[in-house]
């Protein structure tokens, strides 16, 4: 018999390698039975997890599971770190495993020229 507890499907020790400047969606897959729980994202700072206020989030519904998405538009270098989603369900707080974003700052890593620089130096394209 399937449990009717809320379950958050973020893998333990999961990691994502992403590029600064790119858009990225961090998904928190949520399984629930009746009423969709209230879900939030937080970012770990040492042992405390700081709730992310004023960040763009959205829900994506699929047949057997829903996804609470934290949007990075675009990814910034200081988005590097570990994140956790939490659900409030029947007065209980259910916390996911943390997932870690490793942000590569492309500009500093490879000194890749910007689009504007590329436009002013068309010979780079050949």
């Amino acid at each position: 018999k399937e449990s009717c507890d809320v379950q958050l499907y973020i893998k333990r020790q999961s990691e994502h390698s992403i590029l600064a400047g790119d858009p990225f969606e961090l998904e928190c897959p949520v399984k629930y039975c009746a009423n969709r729980p209230h879900v939030t994202w937080c970012k770990l700072n040492g042992t405390t997890c700081v709730k992310l206020e004023d960040r763009q989030t959205s829900w994506k519904e699929e047949k057997n599971i829903s996804f609470f998405i934290l949007h990075f538009e675009p990814v910034l270098p200081n988005d590097n770190g570990s994140y956790r989603c939490s659900a409030n369900f029947q007065s209980n707080l259910i916390e996911s495993h943390s997932t870690t974003l490793y942000v590569t700052d492309v500009k500093s890593a490879s000194e890749r020229p910007s689009k504007d620089e590329m436009a002013s130096r068309p010979w780079l394209l050949y």
């Epitope: 893998k11 333990r12 999961s14 943390s98």
Partner: antibody, heavy 119, light 112 residues
């Protein structure tokens, strides 16, 4: 029925490369981590590394970093271990294992692939 | 790397008797989520390993209840309450709390 079916035994010459496969069924590979483990003849188990088939992220043991490449193709529920520049000391049984990534609810092992490196 | 040390290296026990295998880690296996990721594996002769126990004490489905796991922090124990002939195997502890994951050297369990 849950299965992890590994490719068959291989005999290789020193310096050659090899890619071992691990075909999974009976569960969603995206919900798991695929681990690779080496067992040299008559010895214990050594963790090589693991792959997250959902996003391709891979972790290696420092002892094997640079010597092996771990990957997966989630569309065909198959994981791979590539061994490069083989040496006689790479002769061993290689196992894949699939562990559920969320709550550790299952941990299945393949039957192993025996690799023999000999000139 | 975390060193996992099993004792004894080999063990001979009579059928129906109790078998105890110890596993000591060089640092705590308690993860920041409050769980301890310590597995016990059984490898019978000529076979691949099989997970018996996870999270220190949780039995995999289909594993006989004569097997049990206990411990915390750095010290762990696998107990077989009444040894059966089919328990002849090498037993390994395996930590997957800290990278790189590491195994104990194995304990060979024989029938006396």
């Amino acid at each position: 029925e849950v299965q992890l079916v590994q490719s068959g035994a291989e005999v290789k010459k020193p310096g050659e490369s090899l890619k071992i496969s691990c075909k999974t069924s009976g569960f969603n590979i995206k919900d798991t981590y695929i681990h690779w483990v080496r067992q040299m003849p008559g010895k214990g188990l050594e963790w090589i590394g693991r792959n997250d088939p959902a996003n391709g992220n891979t972790k290696y043991s420092p002892s094997f970093q640079g010597q092996v490449t771990i990957s997966a193709d989630k569309s065909i529920s198959t994981a791979y271990l590539q061994l490069s520049s083989l040496k006689a000391s790479d002769t061993a049984m290689y196992y894949c294992a699939s562990y559920e990534g969320y709550y550790e609810r299952f941990g299945y092992w393949g039957q192993g692939t025996l690799v023999t490196v000999s000139s | 790397d975390i060193v996992m040390t099993q004792s004894p290296d080999s063990l001979a026990v009579s059928l129906g008797e109790r078998a105890t295998i110890n596993c000591k880690s060089s640092q705590s296996l308690l993860d920041r989520d409050g769980k301890t990721y310590l597995n016990w594996l059984q490898q019978k002769p000529g076979q691949s390993p099989k997970r018996l126990i996870y999270l220190v004490s949780k039995l995999d489905s289909g594993v006989p209840d004569r097997f049990s796991g206990s411990g915390s922090g750095t010290d762990f124990t696998l107990t077989i309450s009444s040894l059966q002939a089919e328990d002849l195997a090498v037993y390994y502890c395996w930590q997957d709390t800290h990278f790189p994951y590491t195994f104990g050297q194995g304990t060979k369990l024989e029938i006396k």
